[in-house]
């Protein structure tokens, strides 16, 4: 069973007076309806809260919503209804924060019908004030902050027009008509589709891609017949129909659409989708859907450019274009990614990549736990994570996998053991190594959330009824203790901390409900005085990520070099702080094969580490032979893998090859691109 | 399978520095951390500090700290503790040991290998 | 540091005895605890590790057992061999050991 509350855990002394004094009740004065939260700025403890109240008349909808600020984390609020002249803000788009620091806040308003445009209201101060600002057109989608500039803004209008601000929502200017998608890129980059036939459903397939430099001065087409586009890292996707059918395959440019590199993966047909998984600036993942209603497709890696793709995995869970997926990277550790597969038998089971994708195996059993109904062998069997397809299958599965990059190798998910994913109640597991080792931590589902840089986690137990304990832990999970935070149950409806784990304070939001009326109540509770004294050296131990195996002298390399960290000791309670930054120790790897991808052409074996040249091309790759760009036909047969440090060891050179010989028709070049200004 | 041999016995004067060498043969030197132990005559075992020779990270006991450098040589498979300003409390047995490793946390699974001892005399 | 108290210091038994040692740590230090065996002239061996974990070659005889804050080092049957002093150590803070067990002939 879970370690739980017994003599063996270590205690945390006085706790219940030390959580009584930091434990701050706010009882929001309005009926109960939906109420979202936004964390405005890092570390500055402002929140913003809209409640929303629906009612369906029989000719029109009454609503009312109320706005509230806090600035210490959620302990106290004050209702700034006022501030937006006691307009009724549009849910569906949210409250839109500006990046990093900026302080800006955008709400997008209800208007009534027959008005010319919509209005929003703008903070610059972190929503102590804010200015109403009539827009000269209706809103289709939450105003888009430029990563680079937060004054510039972007938007799509019902009318399909492209709107741009320069100064923060306070002047629009239409930059262009019949936009269907559109995007920043970096250095103020805006990429969009267009439509020339009516509409972007009609045009699907045939669609144009636009780039605009200087918001809107001048324009580039930088691809036609584009079915979609999608930005990942430093590179830019398309999907882009073929001419002689129904097909569409990837097109890949890593600088901004200039030039374009046909992908090495296979083409889709019109049920079929891609999607890019994850990306950053040295790879990404895609997966490709099969042909028919399976429910399954395939991982591919891509080398350095993009171009090259290699599988990955098979079997990969993905029900439909914008469907479910389980693919899950885990952002405490490196290289490591969680997703599920659909094996023969219909099941769903999880798997594991440490090496970023090279890879795939399941999830070692947990040490204390046994092997559940769905396990042929009682003693073999694996976790397997419950993550969005579970969620959306209504399953009592309350919560994603989570992961923070500051609470180094701490995974937390809810799980079954066996041989494949169970409908039974879910229990939930922590892993303190980014997945390689893992433990059950508490029984049957909870929400819960990272403190401290991993300091503290705290879980609320999943319940139809009212609730009033949380559990919290200071030892990774390894013991827990629980803490009324009310006298009174409420119904919970979320746990709510700061983004970036640093925070000490969580907030537990839910309602009150009593015979005639029904309040929103939030509970936020500081754990500062758990953690009275700030963590020193001697806290802190050493650890070595991804280590299996001490007599390899390779122990611990992935991806080229091995990493060791100070991380807190279990035994240690104290602040990680706010400031905390982990601390880490690179070191390169000597290479070896597994260092290096195969090229294209040239495929591995089974159980071969060497790459060896395929004796034909056929299907996609005598595709890429024939559309690809001249200079990737040349090869050694081997790439280091994307983002791969390693030095010295094997270097795997042969003679270059051209394969330009083996392709059976002429090159095609790609079209040219045409340019014009607005 | 692995051994560690140290360096002979030293003779010493007080407020002089004594270094002693640890070095391992047979395994992976580099992946495992190495502590360093005394052990006063009739007395208990006192650890002192410990080094991981990947990166030279280095941490010592509070006792020993500003008194006590611990070093190692990756290319040797070489560990040194070299104490300073000795006094006749010093006098003891010095170990060295490998600190066995199952995961990737390099001091919880207690020390596995042993060097022999090497005994240090401080006598004016 | 975390303190490690040892008892008793001194334990005299009989071949074929049961024998248990006992370590306290001052604040839980969770499964981080190894035990040693140290005869005269020797560097100390290593017998348990992570609490109740045999290191490989050491008789079964011996077991460890215990979490947090109390652990306990059993020899089911004392062999002639085994006259010896025990330390056990924490390694969740900076290392500190017991002050030892010596197990001697009654």
């Known amino acids: 069973s879970a370690p739980g509350e017994d003599e063996e855990c270590g205690r945390v002394r006085d706790f219940v007076a030390k959580l009584a004094n930091n434990t701050h009740q706010h009882v929001f004065d309005d009926l109960r309806g939906s109420v979202s939260l936004s964390w405005v700025g890092d570390s500055t403890g402002v929140i913003l809260v809209l409640t929303t109240f629906h009612v369906p008349l029989v000719i029109m909808t009454f609503g009312q919503s109320k706005l509230y600020r806090s600035e210490d984390y959620g302990k106290n609020f004050k209702d700034i209804t006022d501030l937006i002249n006691n307009t009724f803000i549009r849910t569906e788009f949210g409250m839109a924060i500006g990046p990093e620091n900026s302080g800006k806040v955008v709400l997008t308003a209800e208007v009534s019908g027959g008005s010319r445009g919509g209005r929003i209201f703008r903070s610059s101060d972190f929503a102590k004030n804010f200015v109403q600002t009539d827009l000269p057109f209706h809103p289709l989608t939450q105003m888009m902050y430029s990563p680079q500039n937060s004054d510039y803004l972007l938007a799509l209008s019902t009318e399909n027009g492209l709107w741009v601000s320069k100064n923060f929502g306070g002047k629009w200017e239409e930059i262009h008509k019949a936009v269907c998608l559109a995007k920043w890129g970096s250095d103020n980059t805006i990429f969009f589709t267009t439509y020339a036939n009516g509409s972007c459903k009609a045009d699907l397939g045939a669609l144009e891609l636009w780039r605009t430099s200087d918001l809107g001065k001048s324009f580039k087409t930088i691809g036609v017949k584009i079915y979609s586009f999608g930005l990942g890292g430093r590179f830019l996707f398309a999907s882009v129909m073929a001419d002689k059918d129904t097909t569409r395959r990837i097109h890949v440019s890593t600088d901004q659409g200039d030039t374009w590199s046909m992908a090495q993966l296979p083409s889709v047909g019109q049920e079929q989708f891609y999607s890019i998984l994850a990306a950053n600036d040295d790879m990404v993942f895609m997966h490709v859907d099969e042909p028919g209603d399976t429910g399954f497709g395939t991982i591919f890696t891509s080398d350095d450019r993009g171009i090259v793709y290699s599988k990955s995995l098979d079997r990969h869970l993905y029900t439909t274009t914008g469907g479910e997926t389980d693919f899950t990277n885990v952002t405490s550790l490196r290289g490591v990614y969680i997703t599920s597969v659909l094996s023969e038998d219909n099941s769903i089971q999880t798997m594991i990549t440490f090496d970023q994708g090279g890879r795939w195996t399941h999830l070692r059993k947990p040490e204390n736990s046994e092997c559940d109904a769905t396990a042929k062998n009682k003693n073999e069997c694996s976790l397997h994570i419950h993550a969005s397809y579970s969620i959306s299958q209504k399953l009592n599965v309350p919560m994603a996998p989570l992961s923070e990059p500051n609470a180094v190798g701490i995974v937390i998910a809810h799980g079954s053991v066996g041989d494949a994913i169970s409908v039974m109640v879910p229990d939930v597991y922590i892993s303190d190594d980014g997945g390689y080792s893992w433990t059950k931590m508490l029984e049957g589902p909870h929400y819960y959330t990272i403190l401290d840089s991993g300091g503290i986690i705290v879980a609320i137990e999943h319940s139809s009824r009212p609730i009033n304990v949380i559990k919290f832990s200071t030892d990774e999970g390894q013991c827990w203790q629980t803490y009324t935070f009310t006298r009174d149950p409420i119904y919970f409806t979320g746990l709510a901390s700061e983004p970036g784990a640093r925070s000490m304070n969580i907030s537990i939001w839910g309602f009150t409900e009593s015979f005639l009326t029904s309040q929103a109540v939030s509970y936020t509770i500081d754990f500062k005085d758990i953690l009275e004294r700030n963590c020193e050296e001697k806290d802190y131990t050493i650890w070595l990520a991804h280590s299996t195996d001490p007599e390899d002298y390779e122990d611990g390399c992935i991806l080229g070099y091995k990493e060791q960290f100070l991380r807190l000791r279990k035994s240690s309670v104290c602040q990680n702080g706010r400031d905390y930054v982990v601390t880490k120790q690179p070191s390169i790897c000597l290479c070896s094969l597994e260092d290096f991808l195969c090229d294209f052409g040239y495929y591995r074996p089974e159980n071969d580490s060497k790459c060896v040249e395929q004796p034909e091309l056929k299907g996609h790759d005598l595709e890429f032979c024939l559309y690809g760009r001249e200079e990737h036909l040349t090869t050694n047969g081997y790439r280091k893998i994307p983002g791969d440090k390693c030095q010295g060891g094997v270097n795997p050179v042969r003679e270059v090859k051209d394969l330009k010989k083996k392709c059976t028709s002429n090159f095609l070049s790609p079209e040219k691109q045409n340019s014009k200004s607005n | 399978q692995v051994q560690l041999v140290q360096s002979g016995a030293e003779v010493k004067k007080p407020g002089s520095s004594v270094k002693v060498s640890c070095k391992a043969s047979?395994?992976?030197?580099?992946?495992?951390?190495i502590s360093w132990v005394r052990q006063a005559p009739g007395q208990g075992l006192e650890w002192m500090g410990g080094?991981?020779?990947?990166?030279?990270?280095?941490n010592y006991a509070q006792k020993f700290q500003g008194r006590v450098t611990i070093t190692a040589d990756e290319s040797t498979s070489t560990a040194y503790m070299e104490l300073s300003s000795l006094r006749s409390e010093d006098t003891a047995v010095y170990y060295c040991?490998?600190?066995?490793?199952?995961?990737?946390?390099?001091?919880?699974?207690?020390?596995?290998?042993w060097g022999q001892g090497t005994t240090v005399t401080v006598s004016s | 540091d975390i303190q490690m108290t040892q008892s008793p210091s001194t334990l005299s038994a009989s071949v074929g005895d049961r024998v248990t040692i006992t370590c306290r740590a001052s604040?839980?230090?969770?499964?981080?605890l190894a035990w040693y065996q140290q005869k005269p002239g020797k560097a100390p061996k290593l017998l348990i590790y992570?609490?109740?974990s045999l290191e490989s070659g050491v008789p079964s005889r011996f077991s460890g057992s215990g979490s947090g804050t109390e652990f306990t080092l059993t020899i089911s049957s004392l062999q002639p061999d085994d006259f010896a002093t025990y330390y056990c150590?924490?390694?969740?803070?900076?290392?500190?050991f017991g002050g030892g067990t010596k197990v001697e002939i009654k």
């Open positions: 992570k609490a109740s």
């Open positions: 604040q839980s230090i969770s499964s981080w």
């Open positions: 040991a490998r600190q066995g490793r199952k995961t990737g946390y390099y001091y919880y699974y207690g020390m596995d290998v």
């Open positions: 047979g395994g992976t030197f580099r992946n495992y951390a």
């Open positions: 150590q924490q390694a969740d803070g900076h290392i500190t």
């Open positions: 080094i991981i020779p990947i990166g030279g990270w280095a």
